[in-house]
């Protein structure tokens, strides 16, 4: 497994590790913020979770998300998108039994309670970008990324590599 530090060792009791028949290679507990340092927060409303993008007050505590990393072999002849070789995928869970999901029909990002194994909609290809940022590309829809739209998370179609680094699909991960 990847080398993991103390804060990342949280989780084992919280999350059963067998997802889609494979175990995560490591897990990482982090707060998620936008390129412009707005925080991604999660609120329980009417028995379902809502996701917000907002500026936090000075001493307000950031919400944490558990990132579970998976190794993925991606042969181009199967995917048809010209991408091959090894890559890293993640699932994102802000609280027990809830995971971020890509709703490709609605172009939305939602929190769903689900059983294991997790559906493909809960998996995202993790991109290591410039400026200490990452991006999350939908496993189920190559070229579609989690992004920020109107103070919410949404799915944003990136038509070509020309738009891959627009700031609204860049996120920062932080242990604090």
């Amino acid at each position: 497994a990847f080398g993991i530090s103390g804060v990342q060792k949280y989780t084992r009791a919280l999350h059963d590790s067998s997802i889609t028949g494979i175990s995560p290679i490591t897990e990482y507990l982090a707060s998620l913020s936008t390129y412009n340092d707005q925080s991604i927060t999660f609120a329980l409303e009417d028995e379902s979770y809502e996701i917000y993008v907002e500026d936090l007050k000075k001493d307000e505590k950031k919400d944490k998300v558990l990132l579970s990393y998976y190794e993925s072999q991606h042969p181009s002849n199967e995917s048809g998108d010209g991408v091959d070789g090894k890559m890293l995928m993640v699932t994102l869970s802000p609280t027990k039994d809830f995971w971020l999901h890509a709703n490709n029909k609605e172009h939305s990002v939602e929190l769903h309670k689900c059983e294991k194994p997790l559906p493909d909609q809960a998996f995202f290809v993790l991109h290591n970008m410039h400026s200490n940022c990452v991006s999350f590309e939908c496993k189920t829809d190559p070229g579609v990324f989690i992004g920020v739209k109107d103070n919410h998370l949404a799915l944003i179609k990136v038509d070509s590599s020309e738009n891959l680094c627009t700031e609204n699909i860049l996120f920062k991960l932080s242990e604090t």
């Epitope: 290679i25 982090a30 990132l67 181009s76 091959d84 590599s161």
Partner: antibody
């Protein structure tokens, strides 16, 4: 088959110039960050330069030892990456490898066979 | 710059035994809970080949005999059981940030 093929190496005098080319095949070139790394008996393996994607205006990074002398570029329509080397020095001698990072940009995944550059009078 | 110090510079190990190569970084190569440490094998006249990425994950087509471990600043590559074909140079490399740097290499001989 994923393949990277370098060309353009050879013998050049100190102070001279040379342009290396690398042609990629077997994958969608414009989705990948590309790098040049060189190897010599004296310095071992040494990263030279990296070029990212059109999205970030082809952000480029260079090793301190080549800054201002070397320029990395790419032509996605030709599936090619280049290394223009000016004001060459004896210490630039080595095998130059073209490298593709993995999808997602975490590590060096595919290496070309290399092309040899010799700087000598 | 992150300096990678590999040890030993060379070693000779008997067929079927275990070879262990170490790599120490001058500062942590961890970020996002991932160790940006990779291992490459290079045979004479060939380009380096990816063996292990992110400290402990095998590259495509790499036999299970090759394993990596470590985090932060201390990493190791293990080969067991050793085969004749494993005689080569081995390099560690970090990909955390530019400039990406390599270790000086370890020459592995089979006794």
């Amino acid at each position: 088959e994923v393949k990277l093929e370098e060309s353009g190496g050879g013998l050049v005098q100190p102070g001279g110039s040379m342009k290396l080319s690398c042609v990629a095949s077997g994958f969608t070139f414009n989705k990948f960050w590309m790098n040049w790394v060189r190897q010599s008996p004296e310095k071992g393996l040494e990263w030279v330069a990296e070029i990212r994607l059109n999205s970030i205006n082809y952000v480029k990074d260079y090793a301190e030892s080549v800054k201002g002398r070397f320029t990395i570029s790419r032509d996605d329509s030709k599936n090619s990456v280049y290394l223009q080397m000016n004001n060459l020095r004896a210490e630039d001698t080595g095998i130059y490898y073209c490298i593709r990072r993995n999808y997602g940009n975490w590590f060096f995944e595919i290496w070309g066979a290399g092309t040899t550059v010799t700087v000598s009078s | 710059d992150i300096v990678l110090t590999q040890s030993p510079a060379s070693l000779a190990v008997s067929l079927g035994q275990r070879a262990t190569i170490s790599c120490r970084a001058s500062e942590s190569v961890d970020r996002y809970g991932i160790s940006f440490m990779n291992w490459f094998q290079q045979k004479p006249g060939q380009s380096p080949k990816l063996l292990i990425y992110a400290a402990s994950n095998q590259g495509s087509g790499v036999p299970a005999r090759f394993s990596g471990s470590g985090s932060g600043t201390d990493f190791s590559l293990n080969i067991h059981p050793l085969e004749e074909d494993d005689a080569a140079m081995y390099f560690c490399q970090h990909s955390k940030e530019v400039p990406y740097t390599f270790g000086g290499g370890t020459k592995l001989e089979i006794k």
